[in-house]
């Protein structure tokens, strides 16, 4: 596993904790809360992301607490149960016994159960819809550098393929973005759309999960882009299942 | 079996402009790879100029970028290479080549074209 | 941009011989390193791609290692057809693409 050997730190997760202990001296660095071995050469998977967002000591967090009308992933913040690939596990429960299935970006597609609720498959999430609104400029932003420019972006930072970035759409002030990844288009080393929306969105929220780098600044032909509200739409290979009781609520 | 070919003027006057063109065989423009442009003067080192998706997507070296212009034609199955206000330190091999991976590594490339600056 | 560094710039070497070219990178680039070979008046030709995967029809005496900041490319046992330019190559999301200034691999 990669890390800077100088300083030995993980430049695309600073939730680690990293030291020179691996093969030859090399530099290996360990998520917080899971202790799993990190590749900080690529993005890290967004349940041991979010289980090392928990695991932070309350009073030393320096994340900013969404406020009560964010939307987070409908259910908000939980500490994920992960399999040894750092993917979340089908079944989460919490610790009053609760269960529920949940996607491959780990958010819940079933009624809350108990123990006896079976999540027989992790469902993929093949295509996941970005809804930004940016703050007010002078004029809107021209179409094809906006999409360019968004396109750079997750290719650069995220280092996601264009080929996943299926569509930008504008109408101003709302930006979409949409992320389109199926199973079979997933080859070994290609970063998860999931994850590559997890640290765009940690990002739009000054919550950058890189270390050591500045903060998103994200530029059109020089004018800035300010996103004011971000909203996350997951659709997965299969449908949910939820009840009508749910669905009409 | 890919293949890459490049061809252009040989011989540019300084402020002018370089243009060259690889034609791509064995492989559509349209695959999910990136076509570039590296250059090696005489003597010297390779340099990353520029790159292009099927989609038009660009990515320029920093250095050169206020003077790059590098385009695709699929119904050609090429791609282009514009270089502005030329000089004599402009003057090298000029190589296409494919990239490949999400920022490029090159697995392909061009026998090369020497492009020389002078009046 | 980020500065690769190759050492030495000049190897002086017989058939046989097992031989080692260091790269170093100004910052971290992970294990996003490739390694060429280039002969005089030819292109380069791709060996090495993610610090130490062998590209498809390359001979398996070529190797790389490394990852961070420090790579080596190695030739186990080093043939007649080896003796060329080597240039290492990093491709980090955050950066523009830059090679070393490459090492001259010649006959003892």
């Known amino acids: 596993h990669t890390a800077a050997q100088d300083n030995c730190t993980c430049p695309t997760n600073k939730m680690t904790v990293c030291s020179p202990d691996g093969p030859g001296g090399r530099c290996q660095c360990r998520a917080l809360g899971s202790g799993m071995a990190v590749d900080c050469s690529t993005l890290t998977s967004k349940c041991l992301l979010l289980k090392a967002r928990m695991s932070a000591p309350k009073n030393a967090r320096t994340l900013v607490r969404p406020s009560e009308h964010a939307l987070v992933d409908n259910d908000g913040l939980y500490d994920p149960d992960c399999d040894p690939e750092g993917r979340f596990k089908a079944r989460q429960c919490n610790q009053t016994s609760v269960c529920w299935c949940v996607n491959s970006v780990g958010v819940r597609r079933t009624d809350k159960g108990d123990l006896s609720l079976r999540c027989d498959e992790l469902v993929r999430t093949h295509h996941i819809l970005i809804d930004l609104r940016h703050r007010p400029t002078a004029g809107a932003f021209n179409h094809s550098d906006l999409d360019a420019e968004l396109r750079r972006l997750f290719r650069e930072r995220y280092r996601l393929h264009p080929k996943f970035v299926a569509a930008v759409h504008y109408e101003q002030p709302t930006i979409q973005i949409e992320l389109r990844q199926n199973t079979s288009q997933k080859a070994a080393g290609d970063v998860d759309i999931g994850d590559a929306a997890y640290y765009f969105e940690r990002d739009i929220k000054g919550e950058s999960l890189f270390q050591g780098r500045g903060g998103l600044d994200l530029r059109v032909r020089g004018e800035p882009l300010q996103v004011e509200r971000t909203l996350i739409y997951y659709l997965d290979e299969i449908p949910p299942k939820f009840s009508m009781k749910r669905l009409t609520a | 079996q890919v293949q890459l070919q490049e061809s252009g003027p040989g011989l540019v006057k300084p402020s002018g402009t370089l243009s060259l063109t690889c034609a791509v065989s064995g492989d559509s423009i349209s695959s999910h790879n990136w076509w570039s442009w590296v250059r090696q003067p005489p003597g010297k080192g390779l340099e990353w100029i520029g790159e292009i998706y099927h989609s038009g997507i660009t990515s320029y070296n920093p250095s050169l970028k206020s003077r790059v212009t590098i385009s695709v034609d699929k119904s050609k199955n090429q791609f282009s290479l514009k270089l502005n206000s030329v000089t004599a330190a402009d003057t090298a091999m000029y190589y296409c080549?494919?990239?490949?991976?999400?920022?490029?590594?090159?697995?392909?490339w061009g026998q090369g074209t020497l492009v020389t600056v002078s009046s | 941009d980020i500065q690769m560094t190759q050492s030495p710039s000049t190897l002086s070497a017989s058939v046989g011989d097992r031989v080692t070219i260091t790269c170093r990178a100004s910052?971290?680039?992970?294990?996003?390193l490739a390694w060429y070979q280039q002969k005089p008046g030819k292109a380069p030709k791709l060996l090495i791609y993610?610090?130490?995967s062998l590209e498809s029809g390359v001979p398996s005496r070529f190797s790389g290692s490394g990852s961070g900041t420090e790579f080596t490319l190695t030739i186990s046992s080093l043939q007649p057809d080896d003796f060329a330019t080597y240039y290492c190559q990093q491709y980090d999301s955050y950066s523009p693409i830059t090679f070393g200034q490459g090492t001259r691999l010649e006959i003892k």
């Open positions: 080549a494919r990239g490949s991976g999400v920022i490029s590594y090159f697995d392909y």
């Open positions: 910052q971290s680039i992970g294990n996003w």
């Open positions: 993610k610090a130490s």
